[in-house]
């Protein structure tokens, strides 16, 4: 009796079960009365990264340095390469198709979260007692100088975007 | 539907190359595998090499020095090669596929001076 | 080379008897993926062989099911329940498990 279903890592053809090819491996022939299936491995820059029965391996994604893209982990016969993006650049999605210049934070806000790779920078308003004055990727906002300590007063407050000014104490005659 | 062909040079002299050309239709050669037997009058079979899908080539112990099988996808055509032809390799020559029951009709090579 | 022995040689059967013929290997034909590629042919006078049974025991289409084959490992057999005339000729064992392939020597069946 013919089998209409057969175990893990084969398939069913022409009433018989034959196995899958490996990872790294396509399918030349389907297996017969008389042979295993045929399996050969995937050429350079191909890859198959599961046991399968596909005729022809996948190429490996190229990382186009016109997109800002470089190589993050050479493919192998059984993996696809990784893409990421070149130092400032972060990936437009998660396939890494493509990249952006990190975002920069503007005065007023803060670094969070520096960007990779693959996020982007993540920007904070700068709370109150904090500051920033530049626009930039990596700067978090700088607490206000405190007057007190270098034994000044404050003359002029800070914001979000400027520090206090401090100034000498005014001194009172008698 | 599925056929095979053999096509051979009917006789050949002692010490001479006996080359046979298997032309298949139905089936492409790039997805299966195709072998050779042959059948001396009056004896048994005896299986003498194999061309996979894939390109490679598997030969009997014996006949391994002197068989080369090829073949060309493109124009459905496996050929068997074997050198230093003597009496005892005349026989019927047969190329069969290597799943259900395709045979050729058989090609029968007589090694005569 | 892998061996494989038939035996008998020759077999003389009456008409509507049975039949049984086997074929003994020289190493186990158990593949790496559990298959055994062990078959039967039978080739008619005058004619190219014609596969009877293939891995041991699955009948080829067409196939009458007084053909029977059986087995495992090395030692294997080859039942015809009732043999009809048309059954004549020589059988053969035949294996693809190992490279090379190789057939047995032959059966011949003929009626007495």
């Known amino acids: 009796e013919p089998p209409t279903a057969c175990r893990e890592k084969q398939y069913l053809i022409n009433s018989q079960c034959c196995s899958l090819c490996q990872p790294g491996q396509k399918l030349v022939s389907d297996c017969t009365e008389f042979t295993e299936t045929e399996c050969l491995p995937c050429g350079e820059s191909e890859f198959l990264d599961t046991w399968n029965r596909e005729t022809h391996c996948h190429q490996h994604k190229y990382c186009d340095p016109n997109l800002g893209l470089r190589v993050q982990q050479k493919g192998t016969s059984e993996t696809d390469t990784i893409c990421t993006c070149e130092e400032g650049w972060h990936c437009t999605s998660e396939a890494c198709e493509s990249c952006v210049l990190h975002r920069s934070c503007s005065p007023g806000f803060g670094v969070k979260q520096i960007a990779t790779g693959v996020s982007d920078t993540i920007c904070e308003p700068c709370p109150v007692g904090f500051f920033s004055n530049v626009s930039s990727a990596f700067e978090k906002c700088h607490p206000w100088t405190s007057c007190e300590t270098k034994d000044l007063v404050v003359q002029q407050a800070g914001t979000n975007k400027t520090d206090v000014v401090c100034g000498p104490q005014d001194r009172l005659r008698a | 539907q599925v056929q095979l062909q053999e096509s051979g040079p009917g006789l050949v002299k002692p010490s001479e190359t006996l080359s046979i050309t298997c032309t298949v239709s139905g089936f492409s050669l790039s997805r299966y595998s195709v072998y050779w037997v042959r059948q001396p009058p009056g004896k048994g079979l005896e299986w003498m090499g194999m061309m996979w899908g894939g390109g490679s080539t598997d030969y009997s112990t014996s006949l391994k020095s002197r068989l080369t099988i090829s073949k060309d996808t493109s124009k459905s055509q496996v050929s068997l090669k074997m050198s230093s032809l003597t009496a005892a390799d005349t026989a019927v020559y047969y190329c069969v596929r290597t799943d259900g029951d395709y045979w050729g009709q058989g090609t029968l090579v007589t090694v005569s001076s | 080379e892998l061996q494989l022995t038939q035996s008998p040689l020759s077999l003389p059967v009456t008409l509507g008897q049975p039949a049984s013929i086997s074929c003994r290997s020289s190493q186990s034909l158990a593949s790496s993926q559990g298959n055994t590629y062990l078959h039967w042919y039978l080739q008619r006078p005058g004619q190219s062989p014609r596969l009877l049974i293939y891995k041991v025991s699955n009948r080829f289409s067409g196939v009458p099911d007084r053909f029977s084959g059986s087995g495992s490992g090395t030692d294997f057999t080859l039942k015809i329940s009732r043999v009809e005339a048309e059954d004549v000729g020589v059988y053969y064992c035949?294996?693809?498990?190992?490279?090379?392939?190789?057939f047995g020597g032959g059966t011949k069946l003929e009626i007495k």
């Open positions: 035949s294996q693809s498990t190992h490279v090379p392939w190789t």
